[in-house]
């Protein structure tokens, strides 16, 4: 790489993938291994992200762009830029500090991540339960009891006496 000849800032001509090396009379030097510069005129190279352990490389680092990570099977991304990987659970479960636990009665989770949420309380909308809830599925609300034909029964579970759970994130 040649020394830059800009009258203003000798570093301004250093292209992406290089840095302006003050130790070498402001010569444009290539970024060292595991580092990159995505713009020109940089005086230092950025550190490449490494995708190790539960992280998996989605995009390799190059001299001009950072790596991108996602999570290995059985885990899902959390946080900015997938800065964390959290263990998947089964539907009908939530992740606690002690691992995956089944949803308590009156709550459900239809995903492999997140917390168990209370079943919908159909009676709050003046409706009745058409399909009972499970650990994996919310209740299905139907017409209001007054709309039902005589003799039809409906099951309305009590609202769960429980705070919504919190995952350890």
């Amino acid at each position: 790489f040649e020394r830059t000849r800009s009258l203003q800032d000798p570093c301004s001509n250093c292209p992406a993938g290089t840095f302006c090396d003050n130790n070498r009379n402001q010569i444009c030097s290539p970024c060292p291994p595991n580092s990159f510069s995505s713009a020109g005129g940089q005086r230092t190279c950025d550190i490449c992200r490494q995708c190790k352990g539960v992280f998996r490389t989605r995009k390799e680092c190059s001299s001009t762009s950072n790596a991108e990570c996602d999570c290995t099977p059985g885990f899902h991304c959390l946080g900015a830029g997938c800065s964390m990987c959290e263990q998947d659970c089964k539907q009908g479960q939530e992740l606690t500090k002690k691992g995956c636990k089944d949803c308590c009665f009156g709550t459900f989770n239809d995903q492999k991540r997140g917390i168990c949420r209370p079943w919908t309380n159909c009676s709050l909308d003046g409706k009745s339960v058409l399909v009972n809830g499970t650990k994996e599925r919310d209740v299905v609300c139907g017409p209001s009891p007054a709309d039902l034909s005589p003799g039809a029964s409906s099951v309305t579970p009590p609202a769960p006496a429980r705070e919504p759970g919190h995952s350890p994130q």
Epitope: N34, S35, S38, A39, G41, Q42, T44, C45, D46, I47, C48, R49, Q50, K52, G53, N66, L78, G79, A80, G81, S83, M84, P168, Q169
Partner: antibody
Framework: SLVESGGGLVQPGGSLRLSCAAS?????????ICWVRQAPGKGLEWIAC?????????YYASSAKGRFTISRDNSKNTLYLQMNSLRAEDTAVYYC????????????WGQGTLVTVSS | ALVMTQSPSTLSASVGDRVTINCQAS??????LAWYQQKPGKAPKLLIF???DLASGVPSRFSGSGSGTEFTLTISSLQPDDFATYYC??????????????FGGGTKVEIK
């Protein structure tokens, strides 16, 4: 580059807002920018981080939780640290630093701004 | 919380000496460790990242090694510009409730 400002003398229990102005890179990039402090004659202590990409995730050291708030203004390419209920032990030079690795490795630092908490 | 322990806290050496600084992590941090150099009144400067990778513009007399809990910074031949304080730092983003990131206490390299 990163340039901090907003330091000064403040009484115990008071508040202060520090700024960190970034130039040469965009806050829309996928960087973490953190505040690190250094008490006079002491070592470095990590305080808080914010992701300046889209999500704006924030992280705090236990010593900063509840009293300090990190935020950003992408339109101004500026990072802030709002410090409340300040104590004498918060007296330090406060640096902002940039991380692209997601592992607290800072290749770019500001020059620092001195905060003195004293009556 | 992650704790980084550096030794020695002070090191007296002469120009041309080979200098070694140690850093121990309280838990396994793989190679997620950086070394910084700091001179009085100045901001820290990154020397080494991922335990052994040399940062841009850093002379090759600096090197790092180690993984897990034990790490070392070596200056192969100490130069006048190298008298400073050195910090190790380990850490990684976990979750809001349990974020880990810590600096060692520092090692001051002074003239013998």
């Amino acid at each position: 580059s990163l340039v901090e400002s907003g330091g000064g003398l403040v009484q115990p229990g008071g508040s202060l807002r520090l700024s960190c102005a970034a130039s040469g890179f965009s806050f829309s990039s996928n960087y973490w920018i953190c505040w690190v402090r250094q008490a006079p004659g002491k070592g470095l202590e990590w305080i808080a981080c914010i992701y300046v990409g889209s999500s704006g995730d924030t992280y705090y050291a236990s010593s900063a939780k509840g009293r300090f708030t990190i935020s950003r203004d992408n339109s101004k390419n500026t990072l802030y640290l709002q410090m409340n209920s300040l104590r004498a032990e918060d007296t330090a030079v406060y640096y902002c630093a940039r991380d692209s690795s997601s592992y607290y490795m800072f290749n770019l630092w500001g020059q620092g701004t001195l905060v003195t908490v004293s009556s | 919380a992650l704790v980084m322990t550096q030794s020695p806290s002070t090191l007296s050496a002469s120009v041309g000496d080979r200098v070694t600084i140690n850093c121990q992590a309280s838990e396994d941090i793989d190679t997620y460790l950086a070394w910084y150099q700091q001179k009085p009144g100045k901001a820290p400067k990154l020397l080494i990242f991922y335990a052994s990778d040399l940062a841009s513009g850093v002379p090759s007399r600096f090197s790092g090694s180690g993984s897990g809990t034990e790490f070392t910074l070596t200056i192969s031949s100490l130069q006048p510009d190298d008298f400073a304080t050195y910090y190790c730092q380990g850490g990684y983003y976990t979750s809001s409730a349990d974020t880990r990131g810590a600096f060692g206490g520092g090692t001051k390299v002074e003239i013998k």
